[in-house]
């Protein structure tokens, strides 16, 4: 059966300056390939986090994605600013040259409240 990407929250609200967790779980790690978080869709989408060795300021993984059986690809965004508002997508790729996007969660809106 095809891998499913589950983002359980449609939206989260967070006060400016606070942190928020965006949840994402997969039903399978197959096919082999990376998981990436984006804000927005299409050509203009912005890469927010990749579960690799890259470093992303203010964004960290919630659980240890290096563990073989880990299906949790949630992230934490710290010190949220109004510019962080938008819809965030957890996207599963199949490894290749280039990697192929095969499934996405339904998206979680981040709504930033004034402090």
């Amino acid at each position: 059966t095809e891998v499913k990407v589950i983002q359980p929250e449609k939206s989260v609200s967070v006060a400016a300056g606070d942190s928020t967790v965006l949840n994402c779980t997969l039903t399978s790690l197959l096919p082999v390939g990376p998981i990436r978080w984006y804000r927005g869709v299409g050509q203009s989408r912005q890469l927010i986090y990749s579960f690799t060795t890259e470093h992303f300021p203010r964004v960290t993984n919630v659980s240890d994605a290096t563990k073989r059986s880990n299906l949790d690809f949630s992230i934490r965004i710290s010190n949220v600013t109004p510019e962080d508002a938008g819809t965030y997508y957890c996207v599963k790729f199949q490894r290749g040259s280039p990697d192929t996007e095969i499934q996405s969660g339904g998206g979680t809106e981040v709504y930033v409240l004034a402090k």
């Epitope: 449609k10 939206s11 609200s13 869709v41 299409g42 819809t87 339904g106 809106e109």
Partner: antibody
Framework: DVQLVESGGGVVRPGESLRLSCAAS????????MNWVRQAPGEGLEWVSL????????YYADSVKGRFTISRDNSKNTLYLQMNSLRAEDTAVYYC????????????WGLGTLVTVSS | ETVLTQSPGTLSLSPGERATLNCRAS??????LAWYQEKPGQAPRLLIY???SRATGIPDRFSGSGSGTEFTLTISSLESEDFAVYYC??????????FGGGTKVEIK
Amino acid sequence: DVQLVESGGGVVRPGESLRLSCAASGFTFSSYDMNWVRQAPGEGLEWVSLISGSGEIIYYADSVKGRFTISRDNSKNTLYLQMNSLRAEDTAVYYCAKENNRYRFFDYWGLGTLVTVSS
Amino acid sequence: ETVLTQSPGTLSLSPGERATLNCRASQSVYTYLAWYQEKPGQAPRLLIYDASSRATGIPDRFSGSGSGTEFTLTISSLESEDFAVYYCQQYYDRPPLTFGGGTKVEIK
């Protein structure tokens, strides 16, 4: 049974205001995000606004931003749409729609209330 | 925003015939797509969600298929009550939530 009953429509002049209400029953109102969707005469459906169950999260279509205000009173199981600075192009049937709990599609709709903006 | 284009605009068919309605998205929405039926004087009704899941109480003559940018609503054998306007809606790229322009299924 889920029921959504809109009211408050009518005929107004451009620049005037109107407040629509949607009385909800048959479900735990405060647990669900709610939306307004409209349909101009002879046209398709257009999403207008949404509000989260708590009332904390609110979004508007660009066409109404700054003129319309969505709100809810969970103690009265009622959704509202305050419409200011109305324009002829706001003429439409306005539907109240309950969202599914997982995704932003609409599992129940009201019958709608007609708003006519004309000089 | 994601634009949904429905085709054809009008479908003229007889009861008992098969109806095939199309909805094309300007960019991938995976399977985050719903279909609604609208009849004059009635509340719109959810038929299909997640591209292919039938809503509660919807007869099995209605089926949805597709993913990415191409979607289809099929009514296997039209009944008199199926003559109506049908809309697709995507809920992946948001806000705003967007609808297609509609397909009218009329009696031939």
